[in-house]
């Protein structure tokens, strides 16, 4: 798996002339690092059947790292996949022709030398063109841990096609109890997708009390189906030394 | 080994609708392709029009989708186009095409002329 | 929507090197696919996946792909390359294919 140099490097060189290496000196050892991070943003692909998936991981290290890719976490060869897959080197690249169905899942770029190692994680969803159910990118929204009185933000990346209607919910408590008579469990409308809600993939919390830790919920919907992925919220107070006065207000489900 | 051919009128009157079928043959409709249309005014470039899925999914140049319909049918092993409202500015040669991320079989390619 | 750029034409005699490029945003991350159309004949795809050769191909056509620019490269030209060569993506952020808008090799001579 030895890599030629990246052609996504530049050439330029900002070393001085006392640093740049002769014939019996060896380079300065650089652990692996990204050199294009902008073209990694998009994480989750979601590619109709029949197209290429190409994933990129442009790097640069020295010695000149190698690269390999996993599957779900684990080692992913050619024979994994009907049509196999190719690996460019000179761009740091993995293909996949003709994406069916058991493609879906995550694919790791590991770029690696003796001096370290980085890795990138993509989500890759085959669907049908036509209107199907929302798909949310995965690991999103993440759990927080802050501290009393911060600002959280939470992000739901949603995939969908016909448009969705994104709700952020929150699992509350109503006398005592966090299940209904329903069967269903109490939450709380804390924000949803509308003429009055701008950028409906995120959740902003200003100045967290300790009541605002709990669950909270990424609900998308279409006429199709649904999806929803959660995280927690975990506010921390200070030491006692330094704990402020702070009275909070209960919630209620709307 | 599978081949496509284009077939339907050469002359559509101005305003009415173009409709062309492909037949393929020598392979099935329903393997993991895209079934395409593409097509060339003369004397110009090619313009990718739309293309169907063998379930039925579908996807259109946006600058057509209003006017375009690609249907499969899968009894018949064959897919067809209708723009409707043509002009004089719709007068190409069409072809259709099995893709997957690229076109790898093109039909011969049929003239269609828009003039009353 | 997506916007290939290719040059209308270029010009090169024969046994030289021909270049034709296709410029996009970030083109570099997409699959770019390479097709020769000869006058009144159906296209017939030469490069896929930005430096694949389908079966048939003669290894004189080559193609790269980075950054905003791809790059077809037929070496040791011959009169029987004198065509129109056209670069196509599927756009994975429109979900639409685009084309370039074609470039003519001639060959001089």
């Known amino acids: 798996d030895a890599l030629p140099s990246s052609e996504d490097d530049d050439d330029d060189d900002d070393s001085s002339s006392e640093e740049k290496e002769t014939d019996n000196t060896k380079p300065n050892p650089v652990a692996p690092y990204w050199t294009s991070p902008e073209k990694m943003e998009k994480k989750l692909h979601a590619v109709p059947a029949a197209k290429t998936v190409k994933f990129k991981c442009p790097s640069s290290g020295t010695p000149n790292p190698t690269l390999r890719w996993l599957k779900n976490g684990k080692e992913f060869k050619p024979d994994h996949r009907i049509g196999g897959y190719k690996v460019r080197y000179a761009t740091w690249s993995i293909i996949m022709d003709s994406v069916v169905p058991s493609d879906k899942g995550n694919y790791t770029c590991i770029v690696e030398n003796e001096y370290g190692s980085i890795n990138h994680t993509y989500q890759l969803d085959v669907v049908e063109r036509s209107p199907h159910r929302p798909i949310l990118q995965a690991g999103l929204p993440a759990n927080k841990t802050v501290a009393l009185g911060s600002n959280v933000e939470f992000m739901c990346k949603v995939y969908s096609d016909p448009q969705p209607h994104i709700q952020w919910l929150k699992h509350i408590e109503v006398n005592g109890s966090k299940i209904g008579p329903d069967n269903l469990p109490y939450v709380q409308i804390l924000k949803h997708s509308g003429i009055n809600s701008s950028d409906a993939e995120v959740l902003t919390l200003f100045n967290v009390t300790e009541a605002q830790s709990g669950e909270y919920v990424c609900k998308v919907s279409n006429y199709i189906g649904e999806a929803n992925q959660s995280a927690w919220l975990t506010v921390t107070r200070p030491a006692l030394e330094e704990r402020p006065a702070v009275m909070t207000s209960p919630l209620y489900l709307e | 080994q599978v081949q496509l051919q284009e077939s339907g009128p050469g002359l559509v009157k101005p305003s009415g609708t173009l409709s062309l079928t492909c037949a393929v043959s020598?392979?099935?409709?329903?393997?993991?392709?895209?079934w395409s249309w593409v097509r060339q005014p003369p004397g110009k470039g090619l313009e990718w029009i739309g293309e169907?899925?063998?379930?039925?999914?579908?996807s259109y140049n946006p600058s057509l989708k209003s006017r375009v319909t690609i249907s499969v049918d899968k009894s018949k092993n064959q897919f067809s186009l209708k723009l409707s409202s043509v002009t004089a500015a719709d007068t190409a040669v069409y072809y259709c095409?099995?893709?997957?991320?690229?076109?790898?079989?093109w039909g011969q390619g049929t003239l269609v002329t828009v003039s009353s | 929507s997506y916007v290939l750029t290719q040059p209308p034409s270029v010009s090169v005699a024969p046994g030289q090197t021909a270049r034709i490029t296709c410029g996009g945003n970030?083109?570099?991350?997409?699959?770019v696919h390479w097709y020769q159309q000869k006058p009144g004949q159906a296209p017939v795809l030469v490069v896929y996946?930005?430096?694949d050769r389908p079966s048939g191909i003669p290894e004189r056509f080559s193609g790269s792909n980075s950054g905003n620019t791809a790059t077809l490269t037929i070496s040791r030209v011959e009169a029987g390359d004198e065509a129109d060569y056209y670069c196509?993506?599927?756009?994975?952020?429109?979900?639409?294919?685009?084309f370039g808008g074609g470039t003519k090799l001639t060959v001089l001579g």
């Open positions: 095409a099995r893709a997957t991320d690229w076109f790898d079989l």
């Open positions: 020598g392979g099935s409709i329903s393997s993991n392709n895209w």
């Open positions: 169907i899925y063998h379930s039925g999914s579908t």
């Open positions: 970030n083109i570099g991350s997409e699959s």
């Open positions: 996946d930005d430096s």
């Open positions: 196509q993506v599927w756009d994975s952020t429109s979900d639409h294919r685009v």
